[in-house]
């Protein structure tokens, strides 16, 4: 058993049929010695008396808020949560496996630049009695500070019969060094509590591996005289690290017909302009990627050819 | 050519070669995300690799103030990786494919290090750790880790030379 926060405790349970329960001794936080009784949750029935209560925790029915009283007055509370371990593996019932980029990916994180700011998100089908708490650091043995905000519900989607809820959190490395080569990964830890179930999820990454630039901005077409060719120009996204001479991007320019089956023409360039042939009803799209490190491409920025 | 002790490197040449290094490093190990190498325990492996750290002056401001600290750090790293790529980690079993970019990568590391330090000038270089994995699978894993680490290193080096070529070239 360990303390998650004041008066909230997590009991770690081996979850198999013939596992013995965990013996837990609750102590009433009071100088009083006599006349103390214990209750659980909303029930007024006395579960035991005395300054300590010894219980066996084996089921969610044994978890909950234990309260000690004296003469009708509440002395203290202890909320017990359960953390299940099945076949040596901690349960992951609360969050959905996003399966990208690999199985057992519960947390996904992205950064728009090298400033040390990043966003993580996760999915669940649970709509109520759910809380999240996020901590992060650079490295684990001698951790350096990363500050995370509160997790918030950022999207709701309907998937078949189920509703899916997306939560996200923003974090910022306290003393980021954008130009340095990272040697210690960022660690992100999410505590999830659903009713009386506790779970924790972690992700470990280098900022460089989660970079995904915003799409190029101000995408414009300039027709070239007496030609089907156009000059496409664009700018670095505002959110990208500066100076651009140091934090450079490379770009992919694509000409795509109306039909998805039509052949796509693609050009790769380090410049912020390119000359392409604009077909009728086609559109021109541009996306960006770090020039020197193959992290994710940005989403496409698009303009119609007409 | 770079002359240790103050004069500028051939920024543009260094830029071109470092960008080529980036391309080669990724073609040698393109499996980004397929294998989370940090899960495999990095203890003795890449901890001794020279990283370009915050105080090494490789940021735009540091380069403007005095690029020598940064160039020395890059040079150290290039020599380190050049030795690793020439070691039995890469020459031993399982043999690399004949068209593997590792050979080109090795040569380009050497080329860039020589651009930064012509014969007769010596910056101190870092000792390379004695990594002699016994099993072929250990060697394979070590190659992946070294290449992943190299990708990060050459990315920073390429940024340095690109910025230098754009802002510090005479």
């Amino acid at each position: 058993i360990w303390e998650l926060k004041k008066d909230v405790y997590v009991v770690e349970l081996d979850w198999y049929p013939d596992a013995p329960g965990e013996m837990v001794v609750l102590t009433c936080d009071t100088p009083e010695e006599d006349g103390i009784t214990w209750t659980l949750d909303q029930s007024s029935e006395v579960l035991g008396s005395g300054k300590t209560l010894t219980i066996q925790v084996k089921e969610f029915g044994d978890a909950g808020q234990y309260t000690c009283h004296k003469g009708g007055e509440v002395l203290s509370h202890s909320l017990l949560l359960l953390h299940k371990k099945e076949d040596g593996i901690w349960s992951t019932d609360i969050l959905k496996d996003q399966k990208e980029p690999k199985n057992k990916t519960f947390l996904r994180c992205e950064a728009k630049n090298y400033s040390g700011r990043f966003t993580c998100w996760w999915l669940t089908t649970i709509s109520t009695d759910l809380t999240f708490s996020v901590k992060s650091s650079r490295g684990s043995s001698d951790p350096q500070g990363v500050t995370c905000g509160a997790a918030t519900l950022s999207a709701e989607r309907v998937r078949g019969d189920n509703k899916e809820y997306e939560y996200s959190v923003e974090c910022q490395e306290d003393s980021a060094c954008p130009a340095a080569e990272e040697s210690l990964p960022i660690e992100v830890m999410v505590d999830a509590v659903h009713k009386l179930k506790y779970e924790n999820y972690t992700s470990s990454f280098f900022i460089r591996d989660i970079i995904k630039p915003d799409p190029p901005k101000n995408l414009q077409l300039k027709p070239l005289k007496n030609s089907r060719q156009v000059e496409v120009s664009w700018e670095y996204p505002d959110t990208w690290s500066t100076p651009h001479s140091y934090f450079s991007l490379t770009f992919c320019v694509q000409v795509q017909g109306k039909s998805k089956r039509e052949k796509k023409d693609r050009v790769f360039t380090d410049k912020t302009s390119a000359t392409v042939i604009c077909r009728k009803n086609a559109s021109i799209s541009v996306r960006a990627q770090d020039r020197y490190y193959s992290s994710s491409w940005s989403e496409w920025a698009s303009v119609p050819c007409s | 050519r770079a002359v240790p002790g103050g004069s500028s490197p051939a920024w543009t040449q260094c830029q071109q070669l470092s960008q080529k290094l980036c391309t080669l490093a990724w073609s040698a190990h393109p499996l980004v995300g397929h294998m989370d190498l940090r899960e495999e325990g990095d203890e003795e492996t890449t901890n001794d690799v020279p990283h370009i750290q915050c105080g090494d002056g490789c940021d735009p401001q540091g380069l403007r103030d005095n690029s020598q600290f940064c160039l020395q750090r890059i040079h150290q790293g290039l020599i380190f990786y050049e030795k690793l790529l020439g070691s039995d980690i890469f020459t031993g079993e399982p043999s690399l494919l004949p068209d593997s970019p590792v050979g080109q990568l090795h040569a380009s590391l050497l080329g860039l290090s020589q651009l930064l330090q012509p014969e007769g000038h010596h910056w101190e270089t870092q000792q390379i750790p004695s990594l002699s994995p016994s099993q072929p699978w250990q060697r394979l894993l070590l190659r992946f880790k070294i290449l992943r680490s190299l990708q990060a290193f050459v990315a920073v080096a390429a940024r340095v030379f690109a910025h230098g070529a754009a802002t510090l070239s005479p």
């Epitope: 049929p17 013939d18 596992a19 013995p20 329960g21 013996m23 659980l40 949750d41 909303q42 029930s43 007024s44 029935e45 579960l47 035991g48 209560l53 010894t54 219980i55 066996q56 925790v57 084996k58 089921e59 969610f60 029915g61 044994d62 909950g64 234990y66 | -």
Partner: antibody, heavy 119, light 107 residues
Framework: EVQLVQSGAEVKKPGESLKISCQSS????????IGWVRQMPGQGLEWIGI????????RYNPMFRGQVTMSVDKSSSTAYLQWSSLKASDTAMYYC????????????WGQGTMVTVSS | EIVLTQSPATLSASPGERATISCRAS??????LAWYQQKPGQAPRSLIY???NLQSGIPARFSGSGSGTDFTLTISSLEPEDFAVYYC?????????FGQGTRLEIK
């Protein structure tokens, strides 16, 4: 006052289905799991299983798994034990009981339902 | 599953006497053992939980002791209403199991 009131005695033929009930009152129904115990004529007590009234989480004795089904209706504070196809060997007294949280034993018992299966 | 063996199977005693019933587990159950009393035609009634804790409303002449594999229920001075069948139950490991019962009869 805590009370567990069970449905009346049943006489059934082999192969028939049956659902017996246990209604709780006098306490917070969702705080306490409900269990079932079998007592064959002239025999001792056998633990069938327990069930959460909150989310229908169930722990069956392997000996009874597939033979009986436990269920609960939170809105009426009632637990059920049912059979889809009775056998003569199911003849017994069935008790529902309230599981004490933080312990696991049964602190209050229903009066029992006698089930007789005979052709 | 854990097997609980009660002894004796039948105990004859007189009112006012001390009665002791033993319950032995095939493997350790810690202190997670309960005792029940059942009278003919009635449901069992909880007497003792966690090996030695008296259930609310149960007379103080009933007491329990033991831990691990050996447990004892003691009735310090028998009253006429105490003659019944007594069961021990372990609730440490699923499936929870009961002893076969001890019949306490008037001598």
């Amino acid at each position: 006052e805590v009370q567990l009131v069970q449905s009346g005695a049943e006489v059934k033929k082999p192969g028939e289905s049956l659902k017996i009930s246990c209604q709780s009152s006098g306490y917070s129904f969702t705080t306490y799991w409900i269990g079932w115990v079998r007592q064959m004529p002239g025999q001792g007590l056998e633990w069938i299983g327990i069930m959460s009234p909150v989310d229908s989480d169930i722990r069956y004795n392997p000996m009874f798994r597939g033979q009986v089904t436990m269920s609960v209706d939170k809105s009426s504070s009632t637990a059920y034990l049912q059979w889809s196809s009775l056998k003569a060997s199911d003849t017994a007294m069935y008790y529902c009981a309230r599981r004490r949280p933080g312990q696991g034993y049964f602190d209050f018992w229903g009066q029992g339902t006698m089930v007789t299966v005979s052709s | 599953e854990i097997v609980l063996t009660q002894s004796p199977a039948t105990l004859s005693a007189s009112p006012g006497e001390r009665a002791t019933i033993s319950c032995r587990a095939s493997q350790s159950v810690g202190s997670w053992l309960a005792w029940y009393q059942q009278k003919p035609g009635q449901a069992p009634r909880s007497l003792i939980y966690a090996a030695s804790n008296l259930q609310s409303g149960i007379p103080a002449r009933f007491s329990g002791s033991g831990s691990g594999t050996d447990f004892t229920l003691t009735i310090s001075s028998l009253e006429p209403e105490d003659f019944a069948v007594y069961y021990c139950q372990q609730y440490n490991i699923y499936p929870y199991t009961f002893g076969q019962g001890t019949r306490l009869e008037i001598k």
